[in-house]
């Protein structure tokens, strides 16, 4: 309702006008246009697409559209010296080699520049040795291997199945365990949904399909050679030995046909339990090494990829705000893909394109948003969120003073079952209210709201009659805005039914088979789910940019802070004696949370009552809302992770994709019983409680009456 009060508005120039202008047919057309050839970061094809998007955004009516370029470290296979893995006999002869490429999908046989499957930023090397199967290579999998099964991975090549956690964490864990190489593979248990055919006849992963992806552990640093600063023309670059987050051992991904050949010969220990078994017809023995007749055979990796400083291009479009041009609402998603990008990222980029077109249409009719909207097409997301991070580093001073919100727009779909939202608690009420006004695209929910179908299919585990909204983790371009800069952020997409489909991500993720046809034939033939996601993302941007009072509810932060404090306290109570011995108390944290709750409640009351016609008071109240997320930023960052500065949320140290609450305390408590110096370890727990309590209290005080 408040949106109608924006400047230059006429009755038709409201949220409804914006939403009605969004068309499924346009999204379909844009997706087709963006997916006909590969758009790998750092390539000419992706530069050309950047220029095309720049041109079209200008045509759509944005005030300005600029390219922002950076020279960052990227990684590519050697075109003349392909990567592969072999089984070698005792004479060193290669008796089996993994495939060098994925069989191209129908209609794409003659497309050039399809990058073969590789693990981006793998060092070169040709290690050979015995194989150890390490399940998903999670922290707990290595605990099981090393502590319970007494299996030593030192000097071994480990083979891990994709899924559950970010691949970079798998590689880090393998390195810490002493492995000399890592083979990543897609197990049908995780990437082949029962009852569905393989591509091109369905949306499942064929045996020759392989997931590409970077294996960095950047922890928010951006370009590995210029952490903290933009990779511009006068940048000082670190030497490769000092680069941030690069793996130290060779890594390579394979499909399940090739994995079968490696795993079927495995000997040594049996799998510890059924959770270590996938769906291949192999014993899933852990090793080390091959069984009986094959015990003299070894595995050898041949990795020849190179790291190269390469130019990348972001497209930045601006729609100037009429009333508060110095307040920025940002909608951003990446443009670069591993191959065709049918889902990742172009299902998102096509939605952004249509949102820009709709905003442009309104602007051409004389309307402007209250606040400035920035649109971004990021480059090199697949290589470590590089484009978004470099741009944010370059513009950090503006962003920290002017950034209202960031809405992410990567893949619009990872399924077609229901909505999935991850966002700051400040946006909960915005998302609830918006989805109540949108129509559900779901079968069986005709005439019902999106909120209703979403709540029915994905209920909150805590609040009856409400949908599940998850914590922000990382692995996408919101990271720098939320985790480093403290700008309120959110993301939305359509997802699968997590209850019935236990596979990780979607089966064809980062493979050559992620095509336009995959989406058009199997996921969203009518593009109705894409349209719904456009309405959610676009609707959020519209409200954030246009409502008189920012649509943030600080009381929802109070609720989650209590929940997170309860959770971390419960974890600490696994060690009640040590808590006593080292005088560990959570009193300060719970007191701060209580204060935050009371102050947030009073602020909300004032927000209802203040004189909205007074521009100074309005701006003051809005600034308190805008800067609340910023108040959770600790300038010193988290231990050993200086670019993760949000005290309430950070990507899990064990899985970049997942969000962890009170991450400083959580990490200090993690596996504390194994620490060699308990006094020091519990001292760090106490320090982290202190930091968290101080931060919550300080954030609360930003909501107090200013004088």
């Amino acid at each position: 309702k408040s949106s109608n009060e924006a400047t230059n508005i006429t009755p038709k120039h409201n949220m409804k006008a914006f939403l009605d202008e969004l068309k499924a047919e346009n999204i379909k057309k844009f997706l087709y246009n963006f997916t006909q050839i590969p758009h790998l970061a750092g390539t000419e094809q992706n530069f050309q697409l950047a220029k095309q998007i720049q041109s079209q955004w200008k045509e759509f009516g944005l005030d300005s559209v600029e390219l922002a370029h950076y020279d960052v470290l990227l990684s590519y296979p050697n075109k003349t010296h392909p990567n592969y893995i072999s089984i070698i006999n005792e004479d060193g002869n290669e008796i089996f080699n993994t495939s060098l490429f994925e069989p191209p999908p129908p209609g794409y046989e003659n497309v050039s520049d399809i990058v073969p499957p590789f693990s981006a930023f793998s060092p070169q090397g040709m290690p050979e040795g015995d194989l150890v199967y390490v399940n998903y290579a999670r922290t707990e999998d290595f605990f099981k291997l090393e502590r319970d099964m007494k299996i030593n991975c030192s000097g071994k090549i480990v083979i891990a199945r994709y899924g559950k956690v970010f691949r970079g964490n798998k590689v880090k864990n393998a390195q810490l365990a002493g492995a000399k190489g890592v083979i990543l593979y897609s197990d049908p248990a995780d990437y082949f949904a029962p009852g569905v055919k393989s591509y091109p006849d369905g949306w499942n992963l064929p045996g020759g399909g392989v997931q590409r992806g970077n294996i960095l552990n950047l922890n928010g640093a951006g370009d590995p050679l210029t952490p903290g600063y933009p990779a511009n023309e006068y940048a000082y670059r670190r030497g490769i030995a000092e680069a941030v987050g690069l793996p130290s051992i060779p890594v390579h991904p394979i499909g399940y046909y090739d994995a079968q050949k490696l795993l079927e010969k495995m000997g040594g220990s049996a799998p510890p339990d059924s959770s270590w078994r996938g769906s291949l017809k192999v014993p899933y023995n852990v090793g080390p090494g091959f069984t009986g007749n094959f015990s003299t055979q070894k595995v050898k990796m041949h990795i020849h990829s190179t790291n190269e400083v390469t130019r990348i291009y972001n497209v930045i479009g601006t729609l100037r705000g009429a009333v508060e041009p110095d307040r920025y609402v940002i909608l951003g998603g990446h443009r670069d893909s591993w191959v065709f990008g049918g889902i990742d990222p172009q299902s998102g980029a096509a939605v952004v394109h249509e949102i820009v077109r709709s905003f442009g249409t309104l602007k051409k009719e004389g309307w402007r948003p209250r606040r400035t909207i920035l649109f971004a097409s990021w480059d090199a997301e697949e290589f470590g969120l590089l484009g978004s991070t470099e741009w944010a580093e370059e513009n950090s001073r503006l962003l920290q003073e002017r950034g209202v919100a960031y809405i992410n727009a990567d893949s619009s779909i990872e399924g077609n079952y229901t909505l999935r939202v991850d966002c700051t608690p400040l946006m909960y009420s915005l998302v609830h209210n918006l989805t109540k006004e949108l129509k559900s695209p779901d079968e069986g929910f005709e005439g019902k709201s999106l909120y209703e179908s979403w709540t029915k299919k994905s209920p909150s585990p805590e609040f009856s009659g409400m949908p599940r909204i998850s914590k922000l983790g990382s692995g996408n371009d919101f990271e720098v805005f939320f985790q480093r800069l403290g700008i309120a952020s959110g993301r939305a997409r359509y997802t699968k039914n997590w209850e019935t489909n236990k596979f990780s991500g979607y089966p064809l993720y980062h493979s050559v088979y992620e095509t336009y046809e995959l989406v058009e034939k199997f996921y969203d033939p009518m593009f109705k789910y894409h349209l719904t996601v456009a309405q959610v993302r676009g609707g959020m941007v519209f409200e954030l940019a246009n409502s008189i009072v920012l649509p943030f509810d600080c009381r929802d932060y109070a609720v989650v802070l209590r929940k997170y404090a309860d959770k971390i306290y419960s974890i600490s109570m696994k060690h009640p004696q040590e808590m006593k011995t080292y005088s560990v108390s959570f009193d300060s944290l719970f007191s701060a949370v209580k204060n935050f709750t009371e102050i947030a409640s009073k602020f909300s009351e004032r927000l209802q009552d203040f004189d909205k016609s007074n521009p100074i008071v309005l701006r003051m109240m809005n600034d308190q809302l805008m800067f609340l997320e910023r108040a959770f930023i600790d300038p010193l960052g988290l231990p050993d992770r200086p670019f993760y500065r949000h005290v309430i949320y950070a990507p899990s140290s064990h899985n970049k994709y997942a969000g962890e609450s009170f991450p400083g305390i959580y990490d200090a408590l993690f596996d504390i019983e194994s620490k060699v110096d308990p006094s020091k370890a519990w001292g760090e727990v106490k320090r982290q409680i202190y930091v968290a309590a101080f931060t919550v209290q300080a954030a609360a005080e930003t909501l107090s009456e200013v004088a």
Partner: antibody, heavy 117, light 110 residues
Framework: EVQLVQSGAEMKKPGESLKISCKGS????????VGWVRQMPGKGLEWMGT????????RYGPAFQGQVTISADKSISTAYLQWSSLKASDTAMYYC??????????WGQGTLVTVSS | QAVLTQPPSASGTPGQRVTISCSGS????????VNWYQQLPGTAPKLLMY???QRPSGVPDRFSGSKSGTSASLAISGLQSEDEADYYC???????????FGTGTKVTVL
């Protein structure tokens, strides 16, 4: 609304096994310890033990160690208390209860277990 | 198994003030906070007071708690008929690594 809902009353014979349940709702079940408390007829409250559903870390009161088993299934937000061989002296009301920083703050409605030949 | 000692009963007429004591040791009350629970006839216990003297929302302010050393007490001022119930104190015990409850006090409104 934060709630713990327990399974219904049980009438058993000595030597029989039993498993009673406690289902949580209205909060993140996996992130809070869930304890069990016994109240024998006409008597006071006795703390039996507790479980952290997220990883099934379990603690028992000295009098109950080896006498009962506490377990949980976080996927269905349910905690359990079980006996492999009941005795007449196990006749009591059993409460599950959520434990937080503020102590035992939410209680189930109780499950009456009667053991008689 | 109760290690906290309470008087078995207490009584008063409506409007009177009633106090219940709870005595423990250094390993429980002496080093941890005390909670109080009210158990109305035929119902489950309910949290009445946490952290020695904090009332959950919905608990009338006629209930108050305090702690000193290894003892705690619950006071009901302006006793009402609906206060007729059993009252239990509880605290974490560091040596047992678990909760200990009081023996319970039956409050009767005369």
């Amino acid at each position: 609304e934060v709630q713990l809902v327990q399974s219904g009353a049980e009438m058993k014979k000595p030597g029989e096994s039993l498993k009673i349940s406690c289902k949580g709702s209205g909060y993140n079940f996996a992130s809070y310890w869930v304890g069990w408390v016994r109240q024998m007829p006409g008597k006071g409250l006795e703390w039996m033990g507790t479980i952290y559903p997220d990883d099934s870390d379990t603690r028992y009161g000295p009098a109950f160690q080896g006498q009962v088993t506490i377990s949980a299934d976080k996927s269905i937000s349910t905690a359990y208390l079980q006996w492999s061989s009941l005795k007449a002296s196990d006749t009591a009301m059993y409460y599950c209860a959520r434990d937080s920083y503020y102590g035992i703050d939410v209680w189930g409605q109780g499950t009456l277990v009667t053991v008689s030949s | 198994q109760a290690v906290l000692t309470q008087p078995p009963s207490a009584s008063g007429t409506p409007g009177q003030r009633v106090t219940i004591s709870c005595s423990g040791s250094s390993s429980n009350i002496g080093s941890n906070t005390v909670n109080w629970y009210q158990q109305l006839p035929g119902t489950a216990p309910k949290l009445l007071m946490y952290s020695n003297n904090q009332r959950p929302s919905g608990v009338p302010d006629r209930f108050s708690g305090s702690k000193s050393g290894t003892s705690a007490s619950l006071a009901i001022s302006g006793l009402q008929s609906e206060d007729e119930a059993d009252y239990y104190c509880a605290a974490w015990d560091d040596s047992l690594n678990g909760y200990v409850f009081g023996t319970g006090t039956k409050v009767t409104v005369l």
